[in-house]
Interface confidence: low
């Protein structure tokens, strides 16, 4: 199985600057009936959800069992990236990005990331 | 099959630029990103960076900020690493190497390799 | 100073097992992220060898292995032949440079 994985380098700031940016986070092993709204919903508990997004299959339409989110403050990512989190009845994992651009994304997107997707993930 | 050729060795002054070219063939150039490795005389491999492919956006690691710059020419399938005011310690052979990752791997390899463009700097 | 460690040489006899240790820390090897393998010829470029810690490209013999354990990896070559003499070099990703890094290579001598 090779999936569209990478996710841009918002990262943090440069070394020496005083603020650290928020960056995009994925989130793994979302159960195939979480939608956006669902998504909001559960990380709001934690913070101020800027952006949420659930990756769909181009052709069908359905959930690719992964998504983003985006939290405005840092520490509200910290707090997040440090445990697992029940969505849906699943165990989810949210990780930081760590790679390059998509193998297989369309032109138009500009979504990056990399992470561990379910065994039945299909493209 | 698969394969990234450079352009040919180059003998430079100092002060001077110099433009590396990068062919890819094979496989869609636009599908992947692609990444810049220093290797000093007898020395080992050094990350510079990568470019989106897609985007044409470029990501230099820490120390190759200012005069190096990553560069595409989608309709021929062609990555560019440029260097400006050349000194004696850039003399290294320069390689791109395309970036390749799957779903269930945390972070991306390179592979294929270019073959290597030898620039030398001196006066 | 590379960001990832690994000996400058290791040495064998043909028919030998040698093994290549590469060591991280918690914002690379250790932070999950997976360490792959290229093998240098001399005079030649890079050719990935082991990808996401034991993954072998095709074409690549299985004499060659690659295991990871918490903060390091290693790649271990059973059967040593006269023309796996090469520098090898390990490859992560560091999350505190947010940047692939390299080990600084090792010279492997088949005696």
């Known amino acids: 199985m090779r999936g569209s994985h990478h996710h841009h380098h918002h990262g943090l700031v440069p070394r020496g600057s005083a603020v650290q940016k928020t960056s995009d986070l994925i989130v793994l092993g979302l159960p195939w009936k979480t939608t956006e709204q669902d998504l909001k919903e559960y990380f709001s508990t934690f913070g101020e959800v800027l952006m949420v997004q659930v990756k769909k299959d181009l052709k069908t339409g359905h959930s690719k069992g992964f998504g983003f989110v985006r939290f405005t403050e840092y520490e509200t990512q910290v707090k997040v990236m440090s445990q697992r989190h029940m969505i849906d009845g699943r165990w989810c994992d949210c990780k930081l990005p760590n790679s390059k651009q998509s193998q297989d994304e369309p032109l138009r997107s500009r979504k990056v990331f990399v992470g561990r997707c379910t065994e039945d993930m299909t493209e | 099959q698969v394969q990234l050729v450079q352009s040919g060795s180059e003998l430079k002054k100092p002060g001077a630029s110099v433009k590396v070219s990068c062919k890819a063939s094979g496989y869609t150039f636009t599908s992947y990103a692609m990444n810049w490795v220093r290797q000093a005389p007898g020395q080992g491999l050094e990350w510079m960076g990568w470019?989106?492919?897609?985007?044409?956006?470029?990501t230099y690691a820490q120390g190759f900020t200012g005069r190096f710059v990553f560069s595409l020419d989608t309709s021929v399938s062609t990555a560019y690493l440029q260097i400006s005011s050349l000194k004696a310690e850039d003399t290294a052979v320069y390689y791109c190497?395309?970036?390749?990752?799957?779903?269930?791997?945390?972070?991306?390899?390179?592979?294929?390799w270019g073959q290597g463009t030898l620039v030398t700097v001196s006066s | 100073q590379s960001v990832l460690t690994q000996p400058p040489s290791v040495s064998g006899a043909p028919g030998q097992r040698v093994t290549i240790s590469c060591t991280g820390s918690?914002?690379?090897?250790?932070?999950?992220?997976?360490v792959h393998w290229y093998q240098q010829l001399p005079g030649t470029a890079p050719k990935l060898l082991i990808y996401?810690?034991?993954n072998r490209p095709s074409g690549v013999p299985d004499r060659f292995s690659g295991s990871k354990s918490g903060t390091s990896a290693s790649l271990a070559i059973t059967g040593l032949q006269a023309e796996d003499e090469a520098d090898y070099y390990c490859?992560?990703?560091?999350?505190?440079?947010?940047?692939?890094?390299f080990g600084g290579g090792t010279k492997l001598t088949v005696l």
């Open positions: 996401g810690n034991s």
């Open positions: 470019i989106n492919t897609n985007t044409g956006n470029p």
């Open positions: 918690s914002s690379n090897i250790g932070a999950g992220y997976d």
């Open positions: 490859q992560s990703f560091d999350s505190s440079l947010s940047s692939s890094v």
């Open positions: 190497a395309r970036d390749r990752i799957d779903g269930s791997s945390w972070s991306s390899w390179f592979d294929p």
